[in-house]
């Protein structure tokens, strides 16, 4: 990029630039026509039978340096070749000198800074590589010369240029003194300023375009040349901040359209919301959950948003005394996740009717939540007692949720609790053919006992047709029609409301071997 | 503004010649083509020639070549223009004019006349 | 030399009208074509040159084109001081440079 600090070809008013000395054959100013039929300003000299070693000098304003250490000259000239004119002495000369002079003011004035070089500081001896030659009868034929020098390196505040002339035919059709900076440059999303370079390469930091952030690592910079280009080096850069993506060549940021979003800074572009999420504005890092879906905590901000599932379904209860093992199946709805759970809730009412939370006493197997498994089994029922048990499924969003949790119910009740096995099984009288038995009345926990049925047969006919029974309400029993001196083993149990209790263990008893020997009381 | 300045009204007998000057005041005078420009009375302009006086050579028109001779002077800064052979037809206003710009100082070679002398009334006659 | 023709040689116009005027060259001369305007008893003013360059100081009612062969002056809104007589001309530094015949205009 260059920044122009004088360019004679925008000039409309007349130079009046500084010429040294006042005498004929001086640098004249003059209107000429450019390339784009412009009138211009120039300067011309056409002294060329002076007497040798004379100068002529044409000194432009003042021009202040803005900050540029080398700045550059791009003269345009014409120049007339001394064999093409017949009056031309042997001064006559094909170039022309260019100093300059710094000050940091516009001090100069007709005779100062003295008119030669130091205090001048020469920049070049400039040739025309085309000569305007005449030949007799023959059209003139020449070209526009175009020289570009460099200034420098400028330390005050500006400065002058200067022309000398020793003798050529020449205008001066242009002046353009400009420097050279890097332009303001964005690459990678950084942003690197217009620079003037004041050194053969500058380092330039960068900084981030708006709704980006630095990458991690050393801070972006680029180098700036002197001749006003970045000097080719990859950039670490900037990328953009979450809820923006690279735009136009790495140049910007753009916010995620609606219905998109882009959850980290860095690479990549804005993605389609996930499933049940919306965003309904610009610039979204994240979707937002429509109602009754959610994220976990763990979720990652771009993962589908989800909802707690339905409840478990046809759940099926065995009891086993007091033991309970319910099963079910999963629900119908997952709600989108994969961490489903199970958890119960208990209630048990008593026979009377109140009813309250389970207590502690009962256990479940492998425990009454987070279960991962669609079984529990239930121990410590207490009999004639009902159980309400609510089967509800989870995942990772229901805690979130508001609302009643669904669930699915089953209710046990148990089975009231028999009499306890009648033992002390005891003989009171035997005969050949009949025994007389008695026991102690069982304590029954539900309501008294109703009635006993006994279980005998003789031993070691074991077959199911050589079993029989007696029922009997007392607590003893006369068992008759035995065999004469036959062993026989005898089982009792009790029975009340809640039912029959277990058989006691067996007893062993013997019928008598005569009648002779009468009735006779035996204890067991 | 550069001005042209050019001699007096002459009276010449056919046959015989006139020399016309054309100073030019101030400023450079080499680099500019001078050209020579008559008019016979109630008639059009009739361009003659042309010396750009740094070459010291002039052009003339097809019309009056052999008979008119452009010169210039660098150190006075005067054009001349002399016709020879004079008939009653030479009978006209001699205008010097002078280009628009240098031959240096246009990127093209346009060569108008911007500054015109005020004339000189040739009579020539018997 | 190159022969320059001008029409029309006279016309009659009113002051406001637009005014055309040609010049045609014997062969090419690219743009090096000058219209001047000379009133009676004055030297000749340049008005355009390079075909279609206004000189400073002209009226912007004048304006020139073409090039090659064929050329046109136009004075777009003719204003009193505009009746005088028009030269094409054909010139460049190093030819011989010849003029057109002239248009002379004149009060309607």
């Known amino acids: 990029l260059e920044e122009t600090l004088l360019n004679t070809k925008l000039e409309t008013a007349d130079l009046k630039w500084v010429t040294f000395p006042q005498v004929d054959g001086q640098w004249e100013e003059l209107s000429g026509l450019d390339e784009e039929q412009h009138s211009v300003r120039t300067y011309e000299v056409c002294d060329v039978q002076r007497a040798p070693g004379q100068a002529h000098w044409l000194r432009t304003g003042w021009v202040p340096r803005r900050g540029a250490v080398h700045v550059y000259a791009t003269l345009r000239f014409t120049m007339l070749e001394c064999l093409s004119l017949p009056r031309a002495g042997r001064s006559c000369k094909e170039t022309f000198t260019v100093f300059y002079y710094e000050s940091d003011a516009d001090t100069a004035t007709a005779l100062t800074p003295a008119w030669m070089e130091n205090p001048y500081i020469k920049v070049d001896t400039v040739a025309a590589e085309h000569l305007t030659r005449k030949r007799p009868g023959a059209e003139a034929t020449g070209k526009v010369n175009v020289k570009t020098l460099r200034l420098g390196p400028l330390s005050k505040a500006g400065f002058y240029l200067a022309f000398q002339d020793q003798g050529a035919c020449m205008a001066l059709l242009s002046l353009h003194l400009f420097y050279k900076k890097c332009a303001q440059l964005t690459v990678n999303l950084t942003r690197f300023p217009e620079t003037v370079p004041r050194e053969l390469v500058v380092p330039v930091a960068g900084s981030c375009v708006v709704d980006a952030v630095p990458a991690p690592g050393p801070s972006p910079s680029l180098y700036c040349r002197e001749d006003g280009q970045w000097a080719e080096q990859p950039v670490t850069g900037c990328s953009c901040a979450p809820g923006f993506e690279a735009a136009e060549g790495n140049t910007k940021c753009r916010a995620c359209a609606q219905g998109t979003f882009k959850p980290l800074s860095g690479e990549g572009s804005c993605q389609p919301c996930p499933a049940n999420s919306h965003s309904n504005t610009i610039g979204s890092a994240v979707c937002q959950c429509r109602v009754g879906y959610f994220r976990a905590r763990t979720d990652p901000r771009g993962a589908p948003c989800t909802t707690p599932p339905s409840a478990p379904r046809s759940v099926v209860s065995r009891l086993n005394g007091s033991s309970l093992h319910l099963e079910w199946s999963a629900p119908l709805e997952s709600g989108g996740r994969e961490d489903l759970t199970y958890a119960l809730r208990c209630r048990e009412c008593r026979p009377g009717g109140s009813c309250a939370p389970c207590g502690g006493d009962l256990t479940f197997d492998p425990g009454p939540r987070d279960l991962v498994e669609p079984w529990v089994v239930v121990r410590g029922l207490r009999p004639d007692f009902t159980y309400t048990f609510e089967v509800t499924a989870l995942n990772g969003v229901s805690s979130l949720a508001t609302g009643p949790v669904p669930f699915e119910p089953v209710n046990v009740t148990t089975d009231r609790e028999v009499p306890p096995a009648v033992s002390d099984i005891r003989v009171t009288r035997s005969s050949p053919s009949s025994l007389s038995l008695a026991w102690a009345v069982p304590r029954a926990p539900s309501g008294a006992v109703l009635d006993y049925e006994v279980k005998y047969h003789e031993k070691g006919a074991e077959g199911p047709s050589s079993v029989r029974f007696l029922k009997t309400s007392e607590n003893r029993a006369e068992l008759r029609g035995l065999k004469r001196g036959a062993s026989y083993l005898v089982q009792v149990r009790a029975r009340s409301e809640a039912g029959y209790g277990p058989f006691g263990q067996e007893h062993h008893s013997q019928t008598q071997l005569d009648e002779s020997e009468g009735w006779r009381e035996q204890l067991a | 503004q550069v001005e042209l300045v050019q001699s007096g009204a002459e009276v010449k007998k056919p046959g015989s010649s006139v020399k016309v000057s054309c100073k030019a005041s101030?400023?450079?005078?080499?680099?500019?083509?001078i050209s020579w420009v008559r008019q016979a009375p109630g008639q059009g302009l009739e361009w003659m020639g042309r010396i750009i006086p740094i070459f010291g050579t002039a052009n003339y028109a097809q019309k009056f070549q052999g008979r008119v001779t452009i010169t210039a002077d660098e150190s006075t800064s005067t054009a001349y223009m002399e016709l020879s052979s004079l008939r009653s037809e030479d009978t006209a206003v001699y205008y010097c004019?002078?280009?628009?710009?240098?031959?240096?100082?246009?990127?093209?070679?346009?060569?108008?006349?911007?500054?015109w002398g005020q004339g000189t009334l040739v009579t020539v006659s018997s | 030399d190159i022969q320059m023709t001008q029409s029309p040689s006279s016309l009659s116009a009113s002051v406001g009208d637009r005014v055309t005027i040609t010049c045609r060259a014997s062969?090419?001369?690219?743009?090096?074509l000058n219209w001047y305007q000379q009133k009676p008893g004055k030297a000749p003013k340049l008005l355009i040159y390079g075909s279609s360059i206004l000189q400073s100081g002209v009226p912007s009612r004048f304006s020139g084109s073409g090039s090659g062969t064929d050329f046109t002056l136009t004075i777009s809104s003719l204003q009193p001081e505009d009746f005088a007589t028009y030269y094409c001309q054909q010139n460049d530094f190093y030819s011989p440079s010849t003029f057109g015949q002239g248009t002379k205009v004149e009060i309607k």
């Open positions: 004019a002078r280009s628009s710009y240098t031959i240096l100082t246009t990127y093209y070679n346009y060569n108008a006349m911007d500054n």
């Open positions: 062969q090419n001369i690219n743009n090096f």
């Open positions: 101030g400023g450079t005078f080499s680099t500019y083509a």
